[in-house]
Interface confidence: low
C-alpha cells in the first residue's frame, strides 16, 4: 500500500512484498527489502520502544537507496504497520503484518499493565477500547464489570478491527469501572490488559440571567427570568431558583437543553422563571441555582415592582448651570420613573436635535460652550405608557473671560509726539461684566534694559514693576475717566479710558480686567518723540480704492534726511534694550518707499501717496529722519488700516403696516457698507419727496409721515447704494378710516 | 475641543537645557490658560508652570522659578516651556494642559499624552 503526496518525479518507494497484508506465523522471520530513487528509511511498530534490538536494517548489497527490514523470530506483539519512506517526504509505502500468536492474540502495549478510557455519557458519542489484535479475524467480546456485562458485535455501531480496537456507544459501558476484551481461539479464552473506565464532565463554566440588573415592572405585568448555565459537555445540571413570593399561583418553571454549534465543546442548560402576573410581593431578589452534582454556581439580580407607571425628576437635577465659553458642558436629565421615560430637550421652546456640537440625550452634553448657547433649557419626560409628562428648566450661564479689543488692532510700537494729550483706551467684553478695570504704569526705560530679563515676541514686557496710575511721579499726569457702557458690535462692553494730559516721557501703560471667571489685560507702549510727526491725509481710516497720503513733518532746523519705510510681514525680532520701538536699529525688516518731499518756512514734509488702497498695503509705515547735529536716527511709526470695501445691507426688515387717517407712521431703514451707501426711500416705485407731511432725518435713515392720509397708502421702499450695487426693503402701508374734508387740504 | 500634542522630551545630562514644545488644534486656543504639569514615578502630578489666555501673566512653581519659562504663540496655537539648569529631580513626564484658569490642576479641561524627559546625574 502507498501513502503520501507524489513529489518531484519520485517514485514510490518499492517493497519487495506485493501486498496491503501481510500474514506470518509466530517464530518466523520476517524480512521485507524496499528500493528507491534517494534515501530511505523505515517505521515499525513500536519502533519507539526496545523492541529495536531484534529488527535490524541494513544497505542492500546490490545497489543504491535499497533498505532490507529483518526481525527473526516475530512474535504477535510485532503485528502492525510497516512503512518505508523517503527521508524528509511524505511518499512512503506501508505494509500491514499480522504475527499470529494463537496464545497471545492481543498487541500488548509495552509499558502498560492496564490502560484508561475516558468516556463522556453522550448518546451519540463512540468510545474505542484499543485493544488490537496480531490475528485479523478474531471473534472479539467486551466485558465490562461491575456488574459483569459481555458486548459482542452486531455489524452497526459494536464493532471489532484489529488494527484499530473494540468501538461501542460510549454510554453502554459508563457504569462500569473497567473493561477488557476477549477472544475465543479453539474454545480457549483469552485476553487483552484491563481498561480503567473514566467518566469525564462536570465542569459549569458560567450561570447568567437574563435580564441581568435593573430589572422594573408594574403589577400585572410579566416578569421573565432566563437562566443560562454553560457547561463542558457531558454534564447534567440541576436548577434550583429563590425567589421572594414562593406561595405563587402563575409561576411557572421551564428547564431545557439549548442546541450548540456542532463541534461545540460546550454544552448550554436554560431555566426560565415565568411570573404571569407580578404584585408588589414579588418585588426581591430572584437567584438561579445551577448544579451539576460536583459543582454549582449561581447569580442573582433584583427584581422591582411599581404599584403603576410613573415618571419624575429625581432630587439632583439641576436648575442653573454656570460655564466657561469653550468648556464641555454635561446636563444629565435626573430622573426616575418606569419605565424609563422618552427625553426631549428644547432650548427656549425649539427642540434640539443632536449634531457634532451637541448631544441631546440622557444627557445633554454642549462640547465646546459658547456665549451663545446662554439660555434656558427644558427637558420633557415622557413616560411611554400612561402618557404622563415632566418638565424642569435648567439656566445655562456661560461666563467670558474679558477679552480687549483693542488688543489686536493697536500696532505695539505707535508713537505719540511730545506735549500732546493723549487718549489711550481698553474696550473689554466680558461676561459677567469686569467687576474692575484697573490701570498701571512703568517708565519704558525700566522695563526695556534690564538685561536679566529674558524677552520674546510673546512677551515683549518683562518687567514687573507695574505703578498705580495714581502715582505718576516721575511720569505722565494722569486722569482716568469713569468707565463707559457701550453697545458695539451687539454686544455690551465697558470702555475704560485713561488721559494723559501732556506726553513728556515714554512709558508702558497695562489696564487690566477682571471678572469671576479670568482676567485679561492690554499692554500699551506709549513711546514719546520729539522726532517726525505724522499725520494721514484725507481720513485716518481710508477704503479700498480710495487715495491716502501719509504725511511725514519735521523741523528743519533739527532734521535732515527723511525717509518712508514699511515694516515687512514678519513680527521684529525684538531685543533686549530695544524695546519698544526698535525698527530704527534694524533697517533690514524695512522696505524703503518713494516719497515726495515739500517744505514750508519751518518744516520739511515727506508725503508717502497711496493710490487706490489696497488691503496689501496695511500695516505700520516707519518715518525716519536724522538729527542735524548728532547724527542720531529718530523714528515713528503709524500703523495705517485700510477697509474693506462692503455691498450695501439693510438691517432689519420694514414691516406691513396699518395706520388709521390723521396718526402718524414712523420708519427707520439703518444700512451698513463700506463706502457707506446712500440711503432714498420710494412709493410705489416714485422717488418719495419730502413736504410738510413727510419728513426724512439722519441721512434719510428715518421717515416720518405726519397726520397720514388715505392717498398715503401704498408701497414703501428703503433703497442702500453705493458703488459697489444695491440693497432694498420693501413694506406696504395700509391707510383705514374715511378721509374728513377740511380748509386745511 | 483641544486636542494637545507634547514634544521635545529626552534624555539629557544635569545642567543641560530643553525645550518642551504642545501643539494645539481645535478652535479658541487663544481663550485658554496653558500649563505644564509633570509627574514622577509614584508622585502626584504637579503644576510646573502655568501663562494666562493672555499670555500677560506667568506662574511658575518654587521648585523651577528662574530656570523655567513658559511662552505661548496664539498664531501657532503653542505652548513652550524652556527648561534650564535641568537636575535630576526634574525628570518626569511632562504635561500640557489647557483650561481657564491658571493654578487648580483639577480645573484644566484638555490634556496632552505626555513626553518623558531624564535628566542623568
Known amino acids: 500500500a502507498s501513502v503520501g503526496l507524489p513529489s518531484v518525479s519520485l517514485d514510490l518507494p518499492r517493497l519487495s512484498i506485493q501486498k496491503d497484508i501481510l500474514t506470518i506465523k509466530a517464530n518466523t522471520t520476517l524480512q521485507i527489502t524496499c528500493r528507491g530513487q534517494r534515501d530511505l528509511d523505515w517505521l515499525w511498530p513500536n519502533n519507539q520502544s526496545g523492541s529495536e534490538q531484534r529488527v535490524e536494517v541494513t544497505e542492500c548489497s546490490d545497489g543504491l537507496f535499497c533498505k532490507t527490514l529483518t526481525i527473526p523470530k516475530v512474535i504477535g506483539n510485532d503485528t502492525g504497520a510497516y512503512k518505508c519512506f523517503y527521508r524528509e517526504t511524505d511518499l512512503a509505502s506501508v505494509i500491514y503484518v499480522y504475527v499470529q500468536d494463537y496464545r497471545s492474540p492481543f498487541i500488548a502495549s509495552v509499558s502498560d499493565q492496564h490502560g484508561v478510557v475516558y468516556i463522556t455519557e453522550n448518546k451519540n458519542k463512540t468510545v474505542v477500547i484499543p485493544c488490537l489484535g496480531s490475528i485479523s479475524n478474531l471473534n472479539v467480546s467486551l466485558c465490562a464489570r461491575y456488574p459483569e456485562k459481555r458486548f459482542v458485535p452486531d455489524g452497526n455501531r459494536i464493532s471489532w478491527d484489529s488494527k484499530k480496537g473494540f468501538t461501542i456507544p460510549s454510554y453502554m459501558i459508563s457504569y462500569a469501572g473497567m473493561v477488557f476484551c476477549e477472544a475465543k481461539i479453539n474454545d480457549e479464552s483469552y485476553q487483552s490488559i484491563m481498561y480503567i473506565v473514566v467518566v469525564v464532565g462536570y465542569r459549569i463554566y458560567d450561570v447568567v440571567l437574563s435580564p441581568s440588573h435593573g430589572i422594573e415592572l408594574s403589577v400585572g405585568e410579566k416578569l421573565v427570568l432566563n437562566c443560562t448555565a454553560r457547561t463542558e459537555l457531558n454534564v447534567g445540571i440541576d436548577f434550583n431558583w429563590e425567589y421572594p413570593s414562593s406561595k405563587h399561583q402563575h409561576k411557572k418553571l421551564v428547564n431545557r437543553d439549548l442546541k450548540t454549534q456542532s463541534g461545540s465543546e460546550m454544552k448550554k442548560f436554560l431555566s426560565t422563571l415565568t411570573i404571569d402576573g407580578v404584585t408588589r410581593s414579588d418585588q426581591g431578589l430572584y437567584t438561579c441555582a445551577a448544579s451539576s452534582g460536583l459543582m454549582t454556581k449561581k447569580n442573582s439580580t433584583f427584581v422591582r415592582v411599581h404599584e403603576k407607571p410613573f415618571v419624575a425628576f429625581g432630587s439632583g437635577m439641576e436648575s442653573l448651570v454656570e460655564a466657561t465659553v469653550g468648556e464641555r458642558v454635561r446636563i444629565p436629565a435626573k430622573y426616575l420613573g418606569y419605565p424609563p421615560p422618552e427625553i426631549k430637550w428644547y432650548k427656549n421652546g425649539i427642540p434640539l436635535e443632536s449634531n457634532h456640537t451637541i448631544k441631546a440625550g440622557h444627557v445633554l452634553t454642549i462640547m465646546e460652550v459658547s456665549e451663545r448657547d446662554t439660555g434656558n433649557y427644558t427637558v420633557i419626560l415622557t413616560n411611554p405608557i400612561s402618557k404622563e409628562k415632566q418638565s424642569h428648566v435648567v439656566s445655562l450661564v456661560v461666563y467670558v473671560p474679558p477679552q480687549i479689543g483693542e488688543k489686536s488692532l493697536i500696532s505695539p510700537v505707535d508713537s505719540y509726539q511730545y506735549g500732546t494729550t493723549q487718549t489711550l483706551t481698553c474696550t473689554v467684553y466680558a461676561i459677567p461684566p469686569p467687576h474692575h478695570i484697573h490701570w498701571y504704569w512703568q517708565l519704558e526705560e525700566e522695563c526695556a534694559n534690564e538685561p536679566s530679563q529674558a524677552v520674546s515676541v510673546t512677551n515683549p514686557y518683562p518687567c514687573e514693576e507695574w505703578r498705580s496710575v495714581e502715582d505718576f511721579q516721575g511720569g505722565n499726569k494722569i486722569e482716568v475717566n469713569k468707565n463707559q457702557f457701550a453697545l458695539i458690535e451687539g454686544k455690551n462692553k465697558t470702555v475704560s479710558t485713561l488721559v494723559i494730559q501732556a506726553a513728556n516721557v515714554s512709558a508702558l501703560y497695562k489696564c487690566e480686567a477682571v471678572n469671576k471667571v479670568g482676567r485679561g489685560e492690554r499692554v500699551i507702549s506709549f513711546h514719546v518723540t520729539r522726532g517726525p510727526e505724522i499725520t494721514l491725509q484725507p481720513d485716518m481710516q481710508p477704503t479700498e480704492q480710495e487715495s491716502v497720503s501719509l504725511w511725514c513733518t519735521a523741523d528743519r532746523s533739527t532734521f535732515e534726511n527723511l525717509t518712508w519705510y514699511k515694516l515687512g510681514p514678519q513680527p521684529l525680532p525684538i531685543h533686549v534694550g530695544e524695546l519698544p520701538t526698535p525698527v530704527c536699529k534694524n533697517l533690514d525688516t524695512l522696505w524703503k518707499l518713494n516719497a515726495t518731499m515739500f517744505s514750508n518756512s519751518t518744516n520739511d514734509i515727506l508725503i508717502m501717496e497711496l493710490k487706490n488702497a489696497s488691503l496689501q498695503d496695511q500695516g505700520d509705515y516707519v518715518c525716519l529722519a536724522q538729527d542735524r547735529k548728532t547724527k542720531k536716527r529718530h523714528c515713528v511709526v503709524r500703523q495705517l488700516t485700510v477697509l474693506e470695501r462692503v455691498a450695501p445691507t439693510i438691517t432689519g426688515n420694514l414691516e406691513n403696516q396699518t395706520t388709521s387717517i390723521g396718526e402718524s407712521i414712523e420708519v427707520s431703514c439703518t444700512a451698513s457698507g463700506n463706502p457707506p451707501p446712500q440711503i432714498m426711500w420710494f412709493k410705489d416705485n416714485e422717488t418719495l419727496v419730502e413736504d410738510s407731511g413727510i419728513v426724512l432725518k439722519d441721512g434719510n435713515r428715518n421717515l416720518t409721515i405726519r397726520r397720514v392720509r388715505k392717498e398715503d397708502e401704498g408701497l414703501y421702499t428703503c433703497q442702500a447704494c453705493s458703488v459697489l450695487g444695491c440693497a432694498k426693503v420693501e413694506a406696504f402701508f395700509i391707510i383705514e378710516g374715511a378721509q374728513e374734508k377740511t380748509n386745511l387740504e | 475641543q483641544v486636542q494637545l500634542v507634547e514634544s521635545g522630551g529626552g534624555l539629557v545630562q544635569a545642567g543641560g537645557s530643553l525645550r518642551l514644545s504642545c501643539a494645539a488644534s481645535?478652535?479658541?486656543?487663544?481663550?485658554?490658560?496653558m500649563g505644564w504639569f509633570r509627574q514622577a514615578p509614584g508622585k502626584e502630578r504637579e503644576l510646573v508652570a502655568a501663562?494666562?489666555?493672555?499670555?500677560?501673566?506667568?506662574y511658575y512653581a518654587n521648585s523651577v522659578k528662574g530656570r523655567f519659562t513658559i511662552s505661548r504663540d496664539n498664531a501657532k496655537s503653542a505652548v513652550y516651556l524652556q527648561m534650564n539648569s535641568l537636575k535630576p529631580e526634574d525628570t518626569a513626564v511632562y504635561y500640557c494642559?489647557?483650561?481657564?484658569?491658571?493654578?487648580?490642576?483639577?480645573?484644566?479641561?484638555?490634556w496632552g499624552q505626555g513626553t518623558q524627559v531624564t535628566v542623568s546625574s
Open positions: 481645535g478652535r479658541a486656543f487663544s481663550s485658554y490658560a
Open positions: 494642559a489647557a483650561h481657564k484658569s491658571l493654578q487648580r490642576p483639577d480645573e484644566y479641561t484638555y
Open positions: 501663562i494666562s489666555w493672555s499670555d500677560d501673566s506667568t
